[in-house]
């Protein structure tokens, strides 16, 4: 039975040219993290594998980095990088546990941070 | 449609060396944990090598170790096998594998195989 | 010898649930997944069954995985004449940080 809970950052806002943390945390399980992958819509930026170590997407080589953690940091931030973004923890024995963000990236300087929420 | 194309194998004397390789289309190679698998005439299969999104991590079964090196090139959507120091007991068809986007899912998608005979 | 175990061999005749076992240890199919393959005689094996108990799309709902333990079955009913072949598991091993492969089960259909 899948027990476990995803924190995430929530919604949040960034000014465009600035750099976000995407953060999700796993709670209420002792289940085993094998691996967590990082996705925009369908695409994949990154993956962080317990045995392996981090990968970051080709295509977002320039633009991501790993961590802090299990987390992931967006740089140089542009308007179509507005959007959902996924944490997809994939853990033994549970399954899959999925966690959302929305970014909305801002012209101005009216960037602020939203409320964290919770996705059981 | 997912491809591994193995080319390379052929006979060789104790002692010698041959590259294999691994030619791969229909899918974004570099997002992907790839391995190395062999058969030896009538036996079961042996996994031989595996390496990581960008090669910065391989591991190897005992049996290869310090002889036996993997890599990939991602630009060339391409991975090898180099062996060296080759022994009787390395006569198999040697089998190049994609791995699931969780690695430790196993592998999904194989080649047709190459053969490796040592013999003098 | 390999580090997960299998019957070398099982039979069954057309129609007929045949199950194949695979045994391991805490540090493989305990605290892992399991992969089953099917290779046909001259050919590459091909992927039946991934994360234990799942079913690639194209694979018919005939063949099924499970776990229990340190041991892991596969399950294939209905059995027909084109499902002669050898089967393996497989596991990923967290203390060798290798992939384990059972030694094989050659099936016959009667």
């Known amino acids: 039975m899948m027990t476990g809970t995803i924190e995430t950052t929530g919604n949040i806002s960034a000014e465009k040219g600035g750099s976000i943390i995407l953060q999700c945390h796993l709670s209420s399980t002792t289940a085993q993290v094998t691996q967590v992958n990082w996705e925009q819509q369908d695409q994949l930026l990154a993956i962080c594998n317990a045995d392996l170590g981090w990968h970051i997407s080709p295509s977002f080589k320039d633009r991501v980095a790993p961590g802090p953690g299990l987390g992931l940091t967006l740089q140089s931030l542009t308007v179509n990088d507005t959007g959902e973004y996924f944490c997809i923890y994939h853990t033994y024995p549970d399954g899959t546990y999925t966690g959302r963000i929305f970014l909305e990236v801002l012209e101005s300087s009216v960037a602020e941070h939203g409320a964290r929420f919770q996705i059981p | 449609e997912v491809q591994l194309l193995e080319s390379g194998g052929g006979l060789v004397q104790p002692g010698g060396s041959l590259r294999l390789s691994c030619a791969a289309s229909?899918?974004?190679?570099?997002?992907?944990?790839m391995s190395w698998v062999r058969q030896a005439p009538g036996k079961g299969l042996e996994w031989v090598s595996l390496?990581?999104?960008?090669?910065?991590?391989?591991y190897y079964a005992d049996s290869v170790k310090g002889r036996f090196t993997i890599s990939r090139d991602n630009s060339k959507n391409t991975l090898y096998l180099q062996m060296n120091s080759l022994r009787a007991e390395d006569t198999a068809i040697y089998y190049c594998?994609?791995?699931?986007?969780?690695?430790?899912?196993?592998?999904?998608?194989w080649g047709r195989g190459t053969t490796v005979t040592v013999s003098s | 010898q390999s580090v997960l175990t299998q019957p070398p061999s099982a039979s069954g005749t057309p129609g007929q649930r045949v199950t194949i076992s695979c045994s391991g240890s805490?540090?493989?199919?305990?605290?892992?997944?399991v992969s089953w393959y099917q290779q046909l005689p001259g050919t590459a094996p091909k992927l039946l069954i991934y994360?234990?108990?799942q079913r690639p799309s194209g694979v018919p709902d005939r063949f099924s995985g499970s776990k229990s333990g340190t041991s892991a079955s596969l399950a294939i009913s209905g059995l027909q004449s084109e499902d002669e072949a050898d089967y393996y598991c497989?596991?990923?091993?967290?203390?060798?940080?290798?992939?384990?492969f059972g030694g094989g089960t050659k099936l016959t259909v009667l």
């Open positions: 594998a994609k791995h699931w986007i969780v690695f430790q899912y196993g592998m999904d998608v």
């Open positions: 229909g899918f974004t190679f570099d997002d992907y944990v």
């Open positions: 390496i990581n999104w960008n090669g910065d991590k391989t």
């Open positions: 805490i540090s493989n199919i305990e605290t892992k997944y």
């Open positions: 994360n234990s108990d």
């Open positions: 497989v596991s990923w091993d967290a203390s060798l940080k290798s992939w384990v």
